[in-house]
Interface confidence: low
């Protein structure tokens, strides 16, 4: 007859390993006992169980409460058993030693493989802001055994960097995700993906990224000059930008105090009915925690009676 | 006004897919997000999965198999496919926008789909 | 999926009175907390975001608190218009919802 095993029974940690051993023999042989113990190379053999025929299973002390035979119905030539909640101190050779009558005693020698699935982290990088050169996004660290895979998953342009730490029954994997930020990656996702022998799909976690910046700032309403003329109802100038965090707006006049009546509504200046103390210099101020941007536009109110006798003037010259 | 509206048949037959419509007016989806969450009756919120401005897609885990977000940018619309529907699936459907991260600050009024043949 | 744990699920309170609603983590999730507030019928409307800030049109009565793993809605004198249901939600990779929290009139 002979023995069935595997080389290698791989378990994820705290699963239940089945230690498979099996007496294929010949008609009328019998099995007494399999004796189960642990042989790592360099140290001596420590017995887990014995399972006698007759007298049942025995387990020894080390393993109490952690070995037992798979549930029935039960061949008797089967001497597997089974490895409670497999730990990564379990890891190693394991050899089971089959008496048989007649035939005599076979041995077989097994690798349990318990894979710690990894518990992945993302740590985002320092604040991003428009105008820095290349700068950490996030950082992504996995441990597991045996090391586990990180890589990123994003449109985002960007260059990864990947290193590795072995421990004694485990490795750690850091990748870093470096960009230069810039406005259009406003919202888009940095997801980072983890593989493992010992996890059923791959763990992502996503960091959504956050850039810093403030757009150029400008003035619209003065396209049309003639329409700023004494008396117009409804004028107004509006403050052109763009910011993350969003911006907030404030005017002022570069010439004096703003007049009397111009309402000040976050970035719209409005005016009420024209004259010629609304003519001056006023400024847009936009800020936000990042930066600050200002623009300015000269307003010129015309007068139509003015213009008109310029006008005339022109007209009895020629 | 940022307004988000969901459509699309109330009434699913268990195993076929199914497959709602969020129109997006009154703003620029760029640097946004549209998002769906589902709801069952008397039951808590479920995110389902996202759509950026740039086109790439984000799925909940749990559902990633049968789910499919898309666009039409020219319409300003999104859609969902969700495949092989059954009972469980019976729920109000939101669509919702997110800014930079996964929380939403519009969404549409819902609309329930429920499975059953 | 990092689990959202709200507590209670449910409470009576008068108009005036404080209410709090915790939120726990089952991992850290730093500040990516966000809070909605729920009317039978409706789509939820966002309350808090990145744990303590209030979003647009927020009445000040209401705040968020914590970092990490617990979290807290406090909602001040409370008001006819508060009785709703309250959600927690992380936005640390995929995103989950609490249970919610139901505030019935006492």
């Known amino acids: 007859g002979e023995l069935e095993t595997s080389d290698v029974v791989t378990v994820v940690l705290g699963q239940d390993a089945k230690l498979p051993c099996f007496y294929r023999g010949d008609s009328g042989e019998q099995v007494g006992q399999v004796a189960w113990a642990r042989v790592d190379a360099g140290e001596g053999a420590q017995e887990l169980a014995l399972l006698h025929s007759k007298y049942g299973l025995h387990v020894s002390p080390a393993y109490e409460g952690r070995v037992e035979q798979p549930p029935p119905p039960r061949n008797p030539l089967d001497g597997s058993v089974l490895l409670r909640n497999a730990v990564q101190a379990d890891e190693g050779e394991y050899e089971c030693r089959v008496s048989t009558f007649p035939a005599g005693s076979f041995q077989a020698r097994l690798r349990l493989r318990v894979l710690v699935p990894p518990l992945p982290s993302l740590n985002p990088g320092p604040a991003l802001e428009e105008g820095q050169g290349l700068t950490l996004a996030a950082s992504c660290t996995a441990e597991g055994s045996p090391a586990p895979s990180v890589t990123w998953d994003t449109e985002v342009k960007g260059t990864t960097s990947s290193r590795s730490f072995k421990h004694s029954r485990s490795a750690a994997v850091t990748s870093e995700f470096h960009l230069v930020p810039s406005r259009s990656m406003n919202g888009q996702p940095l997801t980072c993906v983890v593989s493992h022998p010992g996890l059923l799909q791959d763990q992502r976690i996503t960091h959504i990224l956050h850039v810093s910046f403030l757009a150029e700032a400008s003035v619209r309403g003065l396209e049309d000059q003639n329409l700023w003329h004494i008396g117009r109802e409804g004028a107004m100038l509006k403050c052109l930008s763009e910011g993350q965090p969003p911006p907030s707006y404030n005017w002022t006049r570069l010439d004096g105090p703003l007049p009397s009546g111009v309402r000040v509504d976050g970035d719209t200046l409005g005016f009420p009915p024209l004259t010629t103390e609304h003519s001056g210099i006023y400024v847009c101020h936009v800020s936000n925690e990042f930066s600050s941007r200002d623009s300015q536009v000269t307003v010129d109110v015309l007068d139509p009676q003015e213009d008109s006798g310029k006008q005339v003037d022109l007209v009895s010259a020629s | 006004q940022v307004q988000l509206q969901e459509s699309g048949p109330g009434l699913v037959k268990p195993s076929e897919t199914l497959s709602l419509t969020c129109t997006v007016s009154g703003g620029s989806l760029t640097n946004y997000g549209v998002h769906w969450v589902r709801q069952p009756p008397g039951k808590g919120l479920e995110w389902i999965g996202v759509?950026?401005?740039?086109?790439?897609?984000n799925y909940n885990p749990s559902l990633k198999s049968r789910v499919t977000i898309s666009r039409d940018t020219s319409k300003n619309q999104v859609s969902l496919k969700l495949s092989s529907v059954t009972a469980a699936d019976t729920a109000v459907y939101y669509c919702a926008r997110s800014g930079k991260w996964y929380y939403f600050d519009y969404w549409g009024q819902g609309t329930l789909v429920t499975v059953s043949s | 999926d990092i689990q959202m744990t709200q507590s209670p699920s449910s409470l009576s309170a008068s108009v005036g009175d404080t209410v709090t609603i915790t939120c726990r983590a089952s991992q850290n999730i730093y500040s990516n907390l966000a809070w909605y507030q729920q009317k039978q019928g409706k789509a939820p409307k966002l309350l808090v975001y990145?744990?303590?800030n209030l979003a647009d049109g927020v009445p000040s009565r209401f705040s968020g608190s914590g970092s990490g793993t617990d979290f807290t809605l406090k909602i001040n004198s409370l008001q006819p218009e508060d009785f709703a249901t309250y959600y927690c939600q992380h936005f640390w990779g995929t995103p989950t919802f609490g249970g919610g929290t139901k505030v019935e009139i006492k």
């Open positions: 990145a744990a303590t």
């Open positions: 759509i950026w401005s740039g086109g790439s897609t």
